[in-house]
C-alpha cells in the first residue's frame, strides 16, 4: 500500500524544513533497543565514544539516551498534501554535549561533541510505521535510516515499501 516515494516526496525537502522554535517540544530519557531486544550501548574508548548493539547480561543496566523532539513545518507544495504538514524530528544524546550524527559519506552513525545549534546531521525524522517501534530517518538524506548492521549502528538506504517495516531499522524506546 505504501510507496517509498511517498516518504521521499515528503522528506526530499528536509534540507529546507524549518524546525519550529529553537527549543524541543518535549524531551524523554529512554533506553534504546533493537526490534530483537538487543541494547544500544555507548562506550568511551580512546577519548571518543563507540556505539554497540549487544545482548546485555540479566541485571546489567541499560544505557539511557536523551531524546529531544522538535516540530518541523513543511509547506504544502513540498509535502504533496493540501495543507502545511507537521513532522517530528528528534536528536539523540547519550551523554552531555554528545549527539548521534549521520555520516552520510561513510554510511555510519557516530557520536560527535558539538554545541547548539546542532547541525542538520544530528536531526532525524521520527516514524512509527510498526507497532510500538520507531525509525529514525536522516534529515540530511531522505530515504536513509539508522539501522543495525554487523552489531553496529549504520545508515541504511530504504528503497522499497517492503523494507519500511524491516526489522533492522526498527527500534524500541523504554524507560526501564
Amino acid at each position: 500500500a505504501f510507496g517509498i516515494s511517498g516518504v521521499q516526496k515528503y522528506t526530499r525537502a528536509l534540507h529546507d524544513s524549518s524546525i519550529t522554535g529553537i527549543s524541543p517540544i518535549t524531551e524523554y530519557l529512554a533506553s534504546l533497543s533493537t526490534y530483537n531486544d538487543q541494547s544500544i550501548t555507548f562506550a568511551l574508548e580512546d577519548e571518543s565514544y563507540e556505539i554497540y548493539v549487544e545482548d546485555l547480561k540479566k541485571d546489567e543496566k541499560k544505557d539511557k539516551v536523551l531524546l529531544s523532539y522538535y516540530e518541523s513545518q513543511h509547506p504544502s507544495n513540498e509535502s504533496g498534501d493540501g495543507v502545511d504538514g507537521k513532522m517530528l524530528m528528534v536528536t539523540l544524546s547519550p551523554t552531555k554535549d554528545f549527539w548521534l550524527h549521520a555520516n552520510n559519506k561513510e554510511h555510519s552513525v557516530e557520536l560527535h561533541k558539538c554545541e547548539k545549534p546542532l547541525p542538520d546531521q544530528a536531526f532525524f525524522v521520527l516514524h512509527n510505521m510498526h507497532s510500538n517501534c520507531v525509525s529514525f530517518e536522516c534529515k540530511t538524506d531522505p530515504g536513509v535510516f539508522i539501522g543495525v548492521k554487523d552489531n553496529h549502528l549504520a545508515l541504511i538506504k530504504v528503497d522499497s515499501s517492503e523494507n519500511l517495516c524491516t526489522e533492522n531499522i526498527l527500534f524500541k524506546l523504554s524507560e526501564t
Epitope: 505504501f2 518535549t26 504538514g85 510505521m129
Partner: antibody, heavy 121, light 107 residues
Framework: QVQLQESGPGLVKPSETLSLTCTVS????????VHWIRQPPGKGLEWIGV???????DYNSALMSRVTISVDTSKNQFSLKLSSVTAADTAVYYC???????????????WGQGTLVTVSS | DIQMTQSPSSLSASVGDRVTITCLAS??????LAWYQQKPGKSPKLLIY???RLADGVPSRFSGSGSGTDFTLTISSLQPEDFATYYC?????????FGQGTKVEIK
Amino acid sequence: QVQLQESGPGLVKPSETLSLTCTVSGFSLTNYGVHWIRQPPGKGLEWIGVIRAGGSSDYNSALMSRVTISVDTSKNQFSLKLSSVTAADTAVYYCARDHYFSNSYGGSPYWGQGTLVTVSS
Amino acid sequence: DIQMTQSPSSLSASVGDRVTITCLASQTIATWLAWYQQKPGKSPKLLIYAATRLADGVPSRFSGSGSGTDFTLTISSLQPEDFATYYCQQLYNTPYTFGQGTKVEIK
C-alpha cells in the same frame, strides 16, 4: 483542506460483518496514519485501530480477532471491517487522521463527522 | 494495555471559573497524551497534544501539563462554549486508549 467522511450501512444484522469506508481528501494517504474510533450511544470513545503510513495496522486487543483495517490508495479510501457483530457494536464510528507525518504521537486533529451503525435483526 | 483514568467523571462550574481535569495513566507514557473536547452530536476536537502543546485554533485559556503518568487539562476561565465532555488519550503504546471522559456542566 483535510477532509474525512465515513460511509456505510446504518443497519447491520447480528453475526454479520460491519463494513465502513472512510473517504479522504486534502492529504496523501501514504504520509499519515488513520484511526478508527467508535462511541456507543451515551458512552465514551473507544479506539478500534490504526493503519499507519507504512501500511501496518494495530488494533484494540479486545476487538483484534474481529477487526481489519485496510487502505485503497487508488480510491483515497480506508476501510473498516468488523465481523460477528452483536448489539454491543452499535455505535457512532469515526475515522481520524494523525497530526504528524508518519507517526501517531500528536493525536488526531482531523475527524470525520461519524456514522451511526445499529446492530439489530 | 495502558489504562487511562480521568477524574472527575463530571463537574458543575460557572462561566469564569477555573476548571481542572486530571488524567492518570497506569504506566508511564512520557508526554504522549492528547486532550479532546466533544459536544453532543459532534466529532471530538483536538485541544492539546504532546501533553502541553495547544492545537491550531484552540483558545489560550486551555492548557495542558504533566508527564509520565499524571496529566492535567486546565481551562483558566470557563466560557459558555466550553461546556462539553473532555477526553484524554495516550499515544505512547498501542492500543491507544482513551480516558472515560469528564462532562463539564453548567452550575
